[in-house]
């Protein structure tokens, strides 16, 4: 019996079609993605073959204003129009808070959403009961199969999902759940989910009864054979694991931004036992139109988007210096906000002895594209920040060690004076330049806000330790030089949408005067 | 309230082309699909395109591609059609019509006359 | 591409009189992602812009008389107006609202017996 499955994973709100590299379409002959894209390859599919499954891996929520002026109503409607049959969640379903996923998402999905590892307790599991499951069973053709979710379980360091949600550990929470499939007399089971390729592959190790898992979180990209577009693959689609009771368990993900549809051909024999499985993921290119009634959708629902876009999110009293003869150069206040809403957004109270997970921002001079004039009556709006911040990037949660971090600051000033994008600005930590010393060998004082503390102070860097910072996605793979950070990451966890997380905080604080306030220095 | 003007009636030669405008006002112009339709006389109503003017972004139908170009100036909140290598085919009222969240054509220009005479 | 073929062609009735009127697409207009049918309704007058009277099928525009109903899923809706009153002599269309190309039918003429 021969099951094909059709993954997506880390959509992010990805729903018009994007550039390549998923940023918004600026040439429309060249871009890619998109729901109406997608929807135009799925149906093709199950034209074409008798027994096709559509699964999400967890992460629609959160990425562009698609997200922020519809908060998921747009991810009911267009996953339930494209007729996803299951969906895991992700840490970022739960970043406008459990009530931000229930009323959009959970109530108005005509999908099951799935996750074995949250227990609600107290009383939302009264609330929440039914509305997401553990696992659920689908009749595919003549057959059936189970399909049960996961999450990771750093979400509460990753989201607001409140105090009333337990996140266990994946494999401990899915064994039970599998073993009950089991006794349905269910034979052919998949784990979808969405704690990153790295425990994909332990659940496929690890969780008796797993014939396949499907995956997300870490933004995978696998490929057999020559890669269509410019991602490198991490491995083989899909990636072979030997479990620890001598099967081989076929392990997916494909990669992001519904930028391509995971494809999955598993034969199964009667016993359910997995005979082959091959395939690849389908990069959804411009060779494939896009399907007219979802496009007309799009459409509808686009309009909303450029009306918010314009509107006041809150002001500023103060010139915003987002100038590259500041930011390249020294601290700007353009630059201390960004990275203040940044720490602000990533604020979790989850433990006693810290007072946050997290206090420490970077962020490369060259990604601030643009100051904000105060004397527009102090207006600040979503299209002034989409100036600022036009790349459509994500802010990140990284753990890195303080030697890491000495060479992400000596790098940040190792060409100074060149006007080049990697000085970095900070939040959460003081830093000292002597320029009149060699490159490599500038940063004469680092300083770092603890965590660890009732009363947040300023402490010499320690090199062994290990320090969680918040930083754009695009220093996290390396870029502007910053090789060191992406070859020494102990973890990286993928954050919001870098313009969301700056109009929030705007929005919150109503009325904002960042200065410049001593955080670099120069000796 | 949302008002669409329409330039006024055009008599213009075989072969020739002809620019028509749609100005916008009452409403955030750069916001809302407008769409173009043609009726010629005492006949149905005939899609022709759309056009986002936030970002230019353009749908055709089919039967229109390279005979309609559609163009949106932001800074005069004025959409613009142009009809080229015009026959006696073309003769008809052109209108505009913005669309909004429930329907793609609540709100309607006044429709444009285009005559195609030697 | 849609079609939409509209019955009967013209319509003579008189002053508070009921009238149906057609309108059958090629293809479903259901909408799965809000289970409303993506169907509108418009009213043409000599020398005037068509007029939206009913969107998602059953939905009356604004300001439209309660006369005016609009029924019917699928492929197959009914334009009806329960009493007829002189202004409501025109030519009545419907729309495909559901994708590309917008297509439109082929009318109704509503005369005067």
């Known amino acids: 019996w021969e099951l094909t499955i059709l993954h997506t994973n880390d959509v992010h709100s990805r729903l018009e079609q994007t550039s390549e590299d998923s940023s918004k379409c600026v040439n429309a002959s060249r871009c890619m993605g998109g729901v109406a894209r997608l929807f135009t390859k799925v149906q093709q599919i199950r034209r074409a073959e008798p027994n096709v499954l559509l699964l999400d891996a967890g992460d629609q929520y959160q990425g562009t204003i698609w997200f922020t002026v519809y908060k998921g109503a747009e991810v009911a409607h267009f996953m339930n129009a494209l007729r996803y049959d299951a969906m895991a969640l992700g840490n970022h379903e739960f970043d406008n808070g459990v009530e931000g996923l229930i009323e959009p998402l959970l109530k108005e999905a005509k999908f099951p959403i799935l996750s074995a590892n949250i227990k609600a307790k107290g009383p939302l599991a009264s609330q929440i009961s039914g509305l997401y499951l553990p696992y659920k069973v689908l009749p595919v053709g003549d057959e059936v199969v189970g399909i049960v979710g996961y999450t990771s379980k750093e979400t509460p360091f990753l989201s607001n999902p409140g105090t009333n949600l337990v996140f266990e550990d994946e494999i401990t929470a899915l064994q039970p759940e599998v073993d009950k499939l089991k006794t349905l007399n269910v034979n052919k089971i998949i784990a979808l989910g969405h704690s990153g390729f790295e425990m994909d592959k332990l659940i496929a190790q690890k969780v008796r009864g797993v014939d396949v898992v499907v995956g997300g979180h870490s933004n995978t990209f696998l490929y057999t054979g020559n890669p269509p577009s410019k991602e490198v693959p991490a491995g083989k689609y899909p990636f072979i694991v030997t479990s620890d009771d001598g099967r081989k368990v076929p392990v997916v993900q494909a990669y992001a931004f519904g930028k391509y549809l995971g494809y999955l051909k598993i034969e199964f024999d009667e016993r359910g036992n997995v005979i082959s499985s091959h395939g690849n993921p389908i990069l959804l290119n411009s060779s494939i139109p896009e399907d007219p009634s979802i496009k007309a959708d799009i459409n509808k629902w686009r309009i909303k988007l450029d009306n918010y876009s314009t509107q006041e999110l809150g002001k500023t009293i103060v010139y915003l210096d987002g100038s590259s003869q500041s930011c390249r150069f020294r601290e700007c206040n353009m630059g201390n906000l960004i990275c203040d809403a940044m720490i602000n957004n990533n604020l979790r109270h989850t433990d006693e002895m810290f007072w946050n997970h997290v206090s420490m921002c970077i962020l490369n001079g060259g990604g601030i594209r643009s100051p904000i004039d105060e004397r527009n009556n102090g207006t600040i709006t979503w299209e002034n920040l989409a100036a600022v911040l036009p790349f459509g990037g994500t802010f990140d949660l990284v753990q890195l060690k303080g030697s890491t971090l000495k060479k992400a600051f000596e790098h940040s000033v190792h060409r100074y004076g060149q006007s080049t994008g990697e000085f970095l600005q900070v939040g959460g930590i003081h830093v000292v330049y002597d320029l009149s010393r060699k490159p490599g060998d500038r940063v004469v004082k680092l300083d770092v806000l603890c965590t660890k503390c009732r009363v947040p102070s300023y402490d010499p860097l320690k090199m062994d330790e290990v320090y969680k910072v918040i930083l754009p996605n695009f220093l996290a793979n390396g870029g502007d030089g910053f090789q060191m950070i992406k070859d020494e990451l102990l973890r990286h966890d993928s954050g919001d949408q870098d313009i969301n997380v700056v109009s929030t905080y705007i929005s919150k604080m109503k009325v904002i005067y960042p200065a410049v306030e001593g955080r670099i220095k120069f000796s | 309230q949302v008002q669409l003007q329409q330039s006024g009636a055009e008599l213009v030669k075989p072969g020739a082309s002809v620019k028509i405008s749609c100005k916008a006002s009452g409403y955030a112009f750069r916001s809302y699909w407008v769409n173009w339709v043609k009726q010629r006389p005492g006949k149905g109503l005939e899609w022709i395109g759309q056009i986002f003017p936030g970002d230019g972004d353009i749908n055709y139908s089919g039967s229109f591609k390279g005979k309609a170009t559609l163009t949106a100036d932001k800074s005069s909140s004025t959409a613009y059609m142009q009809l080229s290598s015009l026959t006696s085919e073309d003769s008809a009222v052109y209108f505009c019509?913005?669309?909004?969240?429930?329907?793609?054509?609540?709100?309607w220009g006044q429709g444009t006359l285009v005559t195609v005479s030697a | 591409d849609i079609v939409m073929t509209q019955s009967p062609s013209s319509l003579s009735v008189s002053a508070g009189e009921k009238v149906t009127m057609s309108c059958k697409s090629s293809?479903?207009?259901?909408?799965?992602?809000?289970?409303?049918?993506?169907l509108a309704w418009f009213q043409q007058k000599p020398g005037q812009p068509p007029k939206l009277l009913i969107y998602?099928?059953?939905t009356r525009e604004s300001g439209v008389p309660d006369r005016f109903t609009g029924s019917g899923s699928g492929t197959d809706f009914t334009l009806t107006i329960s009493s007829v009153q002189a202004e409501d002599l025109a030519v009545y269309y419907c729309?495909?609202?559901?994708?590309?190309?917008?297509?439109f039918g082929t009318g109704t003429k509503l005369e005067l017996k």
């Open positions: 729309q495909n609202d559901h994708s590309y190309p917008l297509t």
């Open positions: 293809q479903s207009l259901l909408n799965s992602g809000n289970q409303k049918n993506d």
């Open positions: 998602g099928a059953s």
């Open positions: 019509a913005r669309m909004d969240f429930y329907s793609w054509f609540p709100y």
